[in-house]
């Protein structure tokens, strides 16, 4: 692969890496956050950063409970400079082909360029094209939501079914759930899994006369999506007198393969496309977000884009010391590579954000789950945290036990909106939620020593069981309210955190070769499942499983 963006092969070659190694040994591994607060009355002041969104709303990022001090932060920033994170960032924002293994630009940031400033890829200003897609989405979503767009019997659309997988599903699912408060006109459903149950259960609850299907597949060849789409089409035709002319009113495509879209029976006027510089896991900002625009309305969708654009502006214009996503990424590297942390917990204290960790899981793990650098050599360091999470307070009653008292260091992000969309019972629920948000981060930091445990009456062998070591790092993210703009900003924050990690590890965060092998083998095995012969072409385990399956199927 051609890589002209970085001049180092491995992050371990960088002087700041060795410096951080020494700092970790001399102070990092014994650093006590509790003591750091005692030493420095201005620690919170210095280590919290407030992001102001385009609409004036704010998000506070509190990094002060992390295992860092001034010297560590300075060394991490030095590492970012040596790794030329800003150079790679600027190359991305200039539309250069930073996805070196696929020789593509990485330009999802151009999708939220609502300032309409010129943004170039290969000499083409793509801003007018992006704007044109959004105009098409606006017109279409407003027609459907207003009832002007009618189904084949003249009834207005009541339900939208998005059929897609991976980036064509996770983003829209997460965002529609997160912004449910802004919906009201349409119901939206998502079908992703090839398991027939997913489409079957969805088709049970929708009416063919009032349902619009969105087939989301860039190439219109994704096996799972096209299989589900054909099942939906066959169901639709079987319920509507087998008249293919009705398809045009009930199916739209989020794709770039005009030929296949037309072959399927979809009117190409109802085809919403995006360019090759949009990666799947970065595509919710594109036409793939049509289900979002239909659900919450185009104006809210645009606010979502503008929230992300505001973070883009912050990321590109803010000095490193105050650059919020950059600091988030640097902390991740600090824990991953110097503390040996292998996971990253994201716990939203917000039920609307219940799919946010799943979305971030793809964003982070598909981007940075790589072991070869841009210099085409295997890394000699850990990359790609295992990201997981569930909404709190539920999570407190499941895996938080391990976070508090387990043997692993689990850097955690806690997310809360100060204002609830549902301030019921005189805000009782919200206050309880918030008290847990604050308490969990505090408890993880301060812990509980043997003295306190004994003072509380515990004796003998029970004492060590009740001890909390504390000093477990958290970043608290406090938003004013989960609005479309806030959500856009939060996603963009994590995109740029992921970018920063990948830039320092010198990996290509924008390909996904790891998804290919399984797909190829599944095609081979798929053919073997079509006949009744005993299979012996694989290893003994795979043969045994296939043959047992065929016997039982």
């Amino acid at each position: 692969s051609n890589n002209s963006f970085t001049n180092f092969k491995l992050a371990t070659e960088l002087p700041a890496w060795s410096k951080l190694q020494k700092i970790y040994e001399s102070q990092g591994k014994t650093l006590s956050v509790k003591q750091e607060f005692q030493k420095d009355a201005k620690r919170f002041e210095k280590l919290n950063k407030t992001f102001t969104n385009y609409d004036g709303s704010k998000i506070l990022f509190d990094y002060s409970k992390n295992l860092v001090n001034d010297e560590i932060i300075a060394a991490l920033i030095e590492l970012a400079k040596e790794a030329n994170v800003t150079g790679l960032r600027d190359a991305m924002f200039k539309g250069e082909h930073i996805n070196s293994t696929e020789d593509r630009a990485v330009y999802h940031v151009a999708l939220r360029n609502r300032a309409n400033k010129p943004m170039y890829v290969d000499g083409v200003n793509v801003a007018p094209e992006v704007d044109s897609v959004l105009k098409h989405m606006k017109e279409f979503s407003e027609q459907v939501r207003s009832g002007e767009w009618k189904g084949y019997t003249g009834k207005k659309i009541t339900d939208v079914v998005n059929i897609g997988i991976g980036g064509s599903d996770l983003g829209p699912v997460m965002v529609t759930e997160a912004l449910k408060h802004y919906a009201g006109v349409l119901d939206v459903h998502f079908v992703s899994n090839i398991d027939g149950t997913h489409i079957a259960e969805t088709l049970k609850v929708v009416d063919p006369e009032t349902t619009l299907f969105l087939i989301a597949s860039k190439t219109f060849t994704t096996a799972e999506t096209i299989t589900n789409a054909n099942t939906a089409k066959n169901w639709f035709l079987s319920k509507t007198g087998n008249d293919p002319s009705h398809i045009a009113k009930h199916f739209a495509a989020l794709s770039t393969n005009e030929t296949e879209v037309a072959k399927f029976g979809i009117d190409t006027k109802n085809m919403f496309g995006f360019e090759s510089w949009v990666g799947g896991r970065y595509s919710v900002w594109s036409a793939i977000g049509l289900s979002v625009a239909l659900y919450i309305g185009y104006d809210n969708f645009e606010a979502f884009l503008k929230g992300a654009e505001a973070v883009d502006n912050h990321f590109t214009q803010t000095p490193l010391e105050d650059n919020i996503p950059l600091l988030g990424g640097l902390l991740s590297v600090w824990y991953n590579n110097f503390f040996g942390a292998q996971t990253h917990l994201v716990a939203p204290f917000d039920q609307y954000l219940h799919r946010f960790p799943a979305y971030l899981q793809q964003l982070s793990m598909e981007s940075n789950g790589k072991s070869v650098t841009r210099g085409n050599v295997f890394t000699d360091y850990s990359t790609g945290s295992i990201l997981f999470g569930e909404p709190a307070t539920n999570a407190q009653h499941s895996f938080f036990q391990l976070v508090h008292q387990g043997t692993k260091l689990i850097p955690s992000d806690f997310i809360l909106a100060a204002q609830s969309h549902n301030p019921i019972e005189n805000k009782l629920h919200q206050k309880m939620l918030a008290s847990n948000f604050f308490a969990q981060a505090e408890a993880l930091m301060v812990g509980k020593d043997e003295e306190q445990v004994k003072a509380e009456g515990a004796t003998g062998g029970l004492v060590p069981h009740k001890v909390f070591s504390g000093n477990r790092p958290t970043t608290s993210i406090l938003a004013q309210k989960i609005t479309p703009a806030t959500l856009g900003a939060l996603i963009a924050y994590y995109e740029h955190v992921t970018f920063t990690e990948g830039a320092i590890w010198n990996i290509n965060s924008f390909d996904q070769w790891g998804v290919e092998l399984g797909k190829v083998l599944a095609k081979v095995i798929g053919k073997e499942l079509d006949n009744s012969s005993t299979i012996s072409t694989h290893d003994a385990s795979t043969n045994g499983l296939i043959n047992q399956f065929k016997e039982w199927m």
Partner: nanobody
Framework: QVQLVESGGGLVQPGGSLRLSCAAS????????MGWYRQAPGKERELVAR???????DYAVSVKGRFTISRDNANNLVYLQMNSLNSEDTAVYYC???????????WGQGTQVTVSS
């Protein structure tokens, strides 16, 4: 900035052939449907031929079988091969690009085709 530059027009005798070219720059060419329109003096501009981003073609009834539209995505070019020309084909021929995913279009300046003996 966006440019569509037509070439290949000129004077040709009835029954003759011409090949028009349109060089596009400043657009994501492969994502555009490209077309040729023409306008004869005192008449409305009319579609002659169109090729979608996927390569499907459409022709005006009056030119079907005589004209062929093609595209070269690697070089951002669209062609109109015109055979068996007659005086009815005399017009200014305009190159047109229509973005496949939204309401965005561009026009060239036009090239004159005159069929006369």
């Amino acid at each position: 900035q966006v440019q569509l530059v037509e070439s290949g027009g000129g004077l040709v005798q009835p029954g003759g052939s011409l090949r028009l070219s349109c060089a596009a720059s400043g657009i994501t060419f492969s994502s555009y449907a490209m077309g040729w329109y023409r306008q004869a003096p005192g008449k409305e501009r009319e579609l002659v031929a169109r090729i979608t981003s996927g390569g499907s073609t459409d022709y005006a009834v009056s030119v079907k079988g005589r004209f062929t539209i093609s595209r070269d995505n690697a070089n951002n070019l669209v062609y109109l091969q015109m055979n068996s020309l007659n005086s009815e084909d005399t017009a200014v021929y305009y190159c047109h690009s229509q973005y496949s995913y939204g309401p965005l279009e561009y026009w060239g300046q036009g090239t004159q085709v005159t069929v006369s003996s």
